[in-house]
C-alpha cells in the first residue's frame, strides 16, 4: 500500500506549464504543500500538539487492546462461531488496524510532519482512510446481516463460512482500494491549484467524494436499522393484541431502540462532524475548518474504541468470556458443542428477535 510516487497521476487534472507539460511536485517538501493550502505546519511542540498526541496514543492503546480482546473472545468461544460474530471480529480487526494507523499518525504529526516525504505523507493518510473505510464497511455489513436475519425470522443467518470470508475479503479489498486511491492518482501533486486545506496533498474533489461516500453509507445504515425497528414494532404490536405479554414486548422494543440509538448515535457523534468538516473545507471558504480538524479526527477515531463497547460489552456471554480471558480462568466449556448458542447469543440478537419470535419458537 506504499504511495506510488514515480508515475504521473492519471485521475487529477494536471496544471500545465508554458511547454504544455504537466507540472508535478513529487520531490517537493511537505512544507511546500502546506504553505499553499494555508494549513499550519508546526515547527515545535506546543501544548495542544502534546495534548493531542498524549490523548491520541492513549486512545490508540485502548483501541488495540479492546479490539484484540474481542477477536480473542470470538476465537476461543465456540458459541460465537456464527456469521454475526465473524463480522464483529472483523470489525474489531478493522478497529485494531485503525489503532495501528492512528499510532503511526501520532508519531508523524505536529512538528514531525515536516520530516515526511510526499510518499510517506500519502501512506500516513492512506492507512487512516483504509482503516476507517474497513470500520464503516463492517458496520454496514453488520447492519445488512441483522436486516437479513430479522426479515428471514432467524436467530443466525444460514450464511456459510465461505460466504462470510467472501464478505470479509470484499470489505478489506474495498478499504485498501479506498485508502490507496489518493496514492495512485487522485491527489493534487500534479494539480496544485486544487489542493484541499485540511489534507494539503489531497484534491478537493477527493475530499468531497470521501465525505459523500461515508455519509451515504451512514444513511444506508440508518435506513436499514429504521426498517428493522419498524418491522419489529409492527410485529410486537400485532402480537400484543393476541398474547398476554405486552409489557415484555414493550421492554423488548425499548431495548431494541436503546441498542439502535447507541449504535447510530455513536456513529453520528463520531463521524458526522469530521465528514461535514471535509465538505465545509471545500464548500465554505469563510469557514475556519482547520481549527476543529484535530478534535474531529480524534472523535472519528473514538468510534473505533466505542465499537467493542457497543457491540460486545452489551453481550453477557461476551463479558463473561472477557473476564475468563483477563483473569486467565478456564471456561467450563469454551469450545464445547453449540447447543447453548441460542440461549447465549448476543443481547443484540435477542433484542431484535425476542419480540419477533416470542410466539414462534419453531423458526429458531
Amino acid at each position: 500500500m506504499a504511495a506510488i510516487s514515480t508515475s504521473i497521476p492519471v485521475i487529477s487534472q494536471p496544471q500545465f506549464t508554458a511547454m504544455n507539460e504537466p507540472q508535478c511536485f513529487y520531490n517537493e517538501s511537505i512544507a511546500f504543500f502546506y504553505n499553499r493550502s494555508g494549513k499550519h505546519l508546526a515547527t515545535e511542540w506546543n501544548t495542544v500538539s502534546k495534548l493531542v498526541m498524549g490523548l491520541g496514543i492513549t486512545v490508540c492503546i485502548f483501541i488495540m487492546l479492546a479490539n484484540l480482546l474481542v477477536m480473542v473472545a470470538i476465537y476461543v468461544n465456540r458459541r460465537f462461531h456464527f456469521p454475526i460474530y465473524y463480522l464483529m471480529a472483523n470489525l474489531a480487526a478493522a478497529d485494531f488496524f485503525a489503532g495501528l494507523a492512528y499510532f503511526y499518525l501520532m508519531f508523524n504529526t505536529g512538528p514531525n510532519t515536516r520530516r515526511l516525504t510526499v510518499s510517506t505523507w500519502l501512506l500516513r493518510q492512506g492507512l487512516i482512510d483504509t482503516s476507517l473505510t474497513a470500520s464503516v464497511a463492517n458496520l454496514l455489513a453488520i447492519a445488512i446481516e441483522r436486516h437479513i436475519t430479522v426479515f428471514r425470522m432467524q436467530l443466525h443467518t444460514r450464511m456459510s463460512n465461505r460466504r462470510v470470508v467472501v464478505v470479509i475479503v470484499v470489505i478489506w479489498t474495498m478499504a485498501i482500494v479506498m485508502g490507496a486511491i489518493p496514492s495512485v492518482g487522485w491527489n493534487c501533486i500534479c494539480d496544485i491549484e486544487n489542493c484541499s486545506n485540511m489534507a494539503p496533498l489531497y484534491s478537493d474533489s477527493y475530499l468531497v467524494f470521501w465525505a459523500i461516500f461515508n455519509l451515504v453509507t451512514f444513511v444506508v445504515m440508518v435506513v436499514l436499522y429504521a426498517h428493522i425497528f419498524g418491522y419489529v414494532r409492527q410485529r410486537t404490536m400485532r402480537m400484543s393484541r393476541h398474547s398476554s405479554g405486552p409489557r415484555r414486548n414493550r421492554d423488548t422494543m425499548m431495548s431494541l431502540l436503546k441498542t439502535v440509538v447507541i449504535v447510530l448515535g455513536a456513529f453520528i457523534i463520531c463521524w458526522t462532524p469530521g465528514l461535514v468538516l471535509l465538505l465545509l473545507d471545500v464548500c465554505c471558504p469563510q469557514c475556519d475548518v482547520l481549527a476543529y480538524e484535530k478534535f474531529f479526527l480524534l472523535l472519528a477515531e473514538f468510534n473505533s474504541a466505542m465499537n467493542p463497547i457497543i457491540y460486545s460489552y452489551r453481550d453477557k456471554e461476551m463479558s463473561a468470556t472477557f473476564r475468563q480471558i483477563l483473569c486467565c480462568q478456564r471456561s467450563e466449556n469454551p469450545t464445547g458443542p453449540t447447543e447453548g448458542s441460542d440461549r447465549s447469543a448476543s443481547s443484540l440478537n435477542h433484542t431484535i428477535l425476542a419480540g419477533v419470535h416470542s410466539n414462534d419458537h419453531s423458526v429458531v
Epitope: Q15, T17, A18, Q23, F25, A31, F32, N35, R36, S37, G38, K39, H40, E193, C195, N197, P285, Q286, C287, D288, L290, A291
Partner: antibody, heavy 122, light 107 residues
Framework: QVQLVQSGAEVKKPGASVKVSCKAS????????ISWVRQAPGQGLEWIGE????????YYNEKFKGRATLTADKSTSTAYMELRSLRSDDTAVYFC???????????????WGTGTTVTVSS | DIQMTQSPSSLSASVGDRVTITCRAS??????LAWYQQKPGKAPKLVVY???TLTEGVPSRFSGSGSGTDFTLTISSLQPEDFATYYC?????????FGAGTKLELK
C-alpha cells in the same frame, strides 16, 4: 468592487511602534490571504509577511520575525500590521495586498491597498 | 531564500517597440513567477502569474514565458501607458522575494 483601504500616513520616532490597518471590502475577507509589502523611497518591493484570515495562520519574512506582527479582525474585515522598534531604514510605503486565489495561498497578489507612508525620524 | 535577478535595470524604448525583460531565479521555482507593473506613486499591479497567465483586463500584447529558473516578460507593441517599472516575484512559497525592478522609459 474589491478594495483595500489603508490607514493614513504616520510619523514615528526611532524605537517606537506603528500599527497600519487595511480594511477590505467587496469580497469574503476570510477566503483570501493578505500580505504586507513595503517599498523604501526609490527602492524595490520587500515582502514582510502574510496572514490567512480563514485560519489565522501567519507567515513571516525572517528579517521581520519578532518585530512585525500580523493580525486580522474578521468582524470588521480588517488586517493589521504592527512594526516595533522602528529604525530610520523602516521609512517606506507599506502596502497590504490580497491573494489572487481564494481558499488557498498562491503567493501572488491581484489587489493592492492604497499604501501607507511611514516616516521614522528623530 | 530564493534570489530574483532582473535585467536590464532600465530600458529605453519607443511606442510600438517590442521589449523583453528577463528574470532569473537562484533555484528552480517551476512556473511560480509573477510580473507586476508599477507607476510612480501608485501600488503595483499584477500583470502575469504562473509565469504565463495574464491577469484579467491585461492587454494581450503582454506575454510571459519561462519555467524553472529563467523567465521573460514580453510587450509586443509598446503603448504610452506601458511605461512604468516592472517587478518579477516568485510565488513558490514563503519567504517571497522580488526582483530589483526594470524601469521602462520612453526613448
Amino acid at each position: 468592487q474589491v478594495q483595500l483601504v489603508q490607514s493614513g500616513a504616520e510619523v514615528k520616532k526611532p524605537g517606537a511602534s506603528v500599527k497600519v490597518s487595511c480594511k477590505a471590502s467587496g469580497y469574503t475577507f476570510t477566503s483570501y490571504g493578505i500580505s504586507w509589502v513595503r517599498q523604501a523611497p526609490g527602492q524595490g518591493l520587500e515582502w514582510i509577511g502574510e496572514i490567512y484570515p480563514r485560519s489565522g495562520n501567519t507567515y513571516y519574512n525572517e528579517k521581520f520575525k519578532g518585530r512585525a506582527t500580523l493580525t486580522a479582525d474578521k468582524s470588521t474585515s480588517t488586517a493589521y500590521m504592527e512594526l516595533r522598534s522602528l529604525r530610520s531604514d523602516d521609512t517606506a510605503v507599506y502596502f497590504c495586498a490580497r491573494e489572487s486565489i481564494s481558499r488557498r495561498l498562491g503567493w501572488n497578489f491581484d489587489v493592492w491597498g492604497t499604501g501607507t507612508t511611514v516616516t521614522v525620524s528623530s | 531564500d530564493i534570489q530574483m535577478t532582473q535585467s536590464p535595470s532600465s530600458l529605453s524604448a519607443s511606442v510600438g517597440d517590442r521589449v523583453t525583460i528577463t528574470c532569473r531565479a537562484s533555484e528552480n521555482i517551476y512556473s511560480f513567477l509573477a510580473w507586476y507593473q508599477q507607476k510612480p506613486g501608485k501600488a503595483p499591479k499584477l500583470v502575469v502569474y504562473n509565469a504565463k497567465t495574464l491577469t484579467e483586463g491585461v492587454p494581450s500584447r503582454f506575454s510571459g514565458s519561462g519555467s524553472g529558473t529563467d523567465f521573460t516578460l514580453t510587450i509586443s507593441s509598446l503603448q504610452p501607458e506601458d511605461f512604468a517599472t516592472y517587478y518579477c516575484q516568485h510565488h513558490y512559497g514563503p519567504p517571497l522575494t522580488f526582483g530589483a525592478g526594470t524601469k521602462l522609459e520612453l526613448k
